[in-house]
């Protein structure tokens, strides 16, 4: 089962994931004027087991305008854990090997990639808000939400954040940017929707759990 | 709920055209494949094809293609499976399927009974 | 592309367990983990009840098990029950991005 919903959205706030636990798919979208090569990857997938996760199946797109003639193989999961490039890229590195067991980082842009990321993720995943700029967090509650299973149905906690103007109110005394805290332990491998807009996240998991959660880089 | 909900049985003569339906609900359904898969009388599942209504990119299976249309209508949440001209040989129970995590189908339709009858 | 091999039909008694078996090629179940299985009960849509070979959606019971030795993948059910009768089909994604489903197997619990 696949969460029923999306996180819940907080005014003036924006959410992502610190690392993708395994089962997790994000989907190959193409920017307009291209589309995911014939027999190329429908989505990328978390997988591995507790002591290496890797992205499955590379996304790939090409122009809508030319016609692909080249045959293109999307590569094996089992057997083929080097991955398959596109010309123009170079070898992938071994950067989505998160730091957490059983957990994948950021993907690697793809060429031609649209502007939006949507992922499905699974039970047990914590995303992270944060204020978007010119905004900054009133309440030091939890900023984060995780998808759980309560009587077989999916749901999303709900993150304690309320942010505000920079010019409505100063900030509280003692007010820090929330930090990353260990993810939950899945209560069963259900996947969650979520969709990253507007920006291209290039996130890496955080070496230790001290340092400030996002360090997202805009492209 | 998440659930797919498909059109009603439909009784066609050889050579008429017919569009059936299949509705996504209680979840994101521009963001998930649909494939729609095949059950002849009495006979095992066939996957015909696939689509992907967040942009309608389509794959078929080559027994399938230039047999049948898939498309979708992403502001409705409904996929389709049309034929131009049916043959009693397409008299089946059709199915469509959401496409989950590893390449699974995890929701299913109840089904669509196309009967093709001169 | 041709459908997976199973076996026409398998029968047992309650208590008892049952493999059947799908076999494929190099370009759908040896190439990749994702094979899927589907229960089929009487006049019902099919219920996906294994992915990525062995793993069991939340709800399915664990006496459903799966695995995988190069082109043949097979279901294993343990300690059989009357209301496991059923059709059973194998899946597997396959080299060309498509899908390919095995011609089913009817279980019969004698």
């Known amino acids: 089962e696949l969460c029923d919903d999306d996180p819940p959205e907080i005014p003036h706030a924006t959410f992502k994931a610190m690392a993708y636990k395994e089962g997790t798919m994000l989907n190959c979208e193409c920017k307009r004027g291209f589309r995911r090569i014939k027999s190329g990857s429908l989505y990328m997938l978390c997988t591995g087991n507790s002591s290496h996760s890797s992205w499955d199946n590379q996304c790939q797109c090409t122009s809508s305008a030319t016609r692909n003639t080249t045959k293109q193989v999307t590569p094996q999961p089992e057997e083929q854990k080097e991955r398959k490039t596109t010309e123009m890229q170079s070898p992938m590195q071994p950067v989505d090997q998160a730091s957490l067991p059983g957990h994948c980082r950021e993907p690697p842009p793809w060429e031609n990639e649209a502007t939006e990321r949507i992922y499905h993720f699974v039970v047990g995943q914590m995303v992270y808000y944060q204020c978007v700029q010119g905004y900054r967090a009133l309440h030091r509650g939890p900023a984060e939400s995780v998808c759980k299973m309560t009587h077989g149905k999916t749901r999303w906690t709900q993150p304690q954040l309320i942010c505000t103007g920079e010019m409505e109110t100063s900030q509280f005394p003692g007010e820090e940017k929330p930090q990353a805290s260990p993810e939950g332990r899945p209560e069963s491998e259900t996947s969650c929707l979520v969709t990253t807009t507007d920006f291209q996240i290039q996130t890496e998991m955080a070496a230790t759990m001290e340092t400030s959660i996002f360090t997202t880089e805009y492209q | 709920q998440v659930q797919l909900v498909q059109s009603g049985a439909e009784v066609k003569k050889p050579g008429e055209s017919l569009k059936i339906s299949c509705k996504g609900s209680?979840?994101?359904?521009?963001?998930?494949?649909i494939g729609w898969v095949r059950q002849m009388p009495g006979k095992g599942l066939e996957w015909m094809g696939i689509?992907?209504?967040?942009?309608?990119?389509?794959r078929y299976s080559p027994s399938f293609q230039g047999q049948v249309t898939i498309s979708a209508d992403k502001s409705i949440s409904t996929a389709y499976l049309q034929w131009s001209s049916l043959k009693a040989s397409d008299t089946a129970m059709y199915y469509c399927?959401?496409?989950?995590?590893?390449?699974?189908?995890?929701?299913w339709g109840r089904g669509t009974m196309v009967t093709v009858s001169s | 592309q041709s459908a997976l091999t199973q076996p026409a039909s398998v029968s047992a008694s309650p208590g008892q367990s049952i493999t059947i078996s799908c076999t494929g090629t190099s370009s759908d179940v040896g190439a990749y983990i994702y094979v899927s299985w589907y229960q089929q009960l009487s006049g019902k849509p099919p219920k996906l009840i294994l992915y990525?070979?062995?793993k069991r959606p939340s709800g399915i019971s664990d006496r459903f098990s799966g695995s995988k030795s190069g082109n043949t993948a097979s279901l294993t059910i343990s300690g059989l029950q009357a209301d496991d009768e059923a059709d059973y089909y194998c899946s597997s994604y396959t080299r060309s991005s498509t899908w390919v489903f095995g011609g089913g197997t009817q279980l019969t619990v004698l």
């Open positions: 990525d070979v062995s």
């Open positions: 399927a959401r496409l989950g995590s590893a390449y699974a189908f995890d929701i």
């Open positions: 689509i992907y209504p967040g942009d309608s990119d389509t």
């Open positions: 209680g979840y994101s359904s521009t963001s998930y494949w």
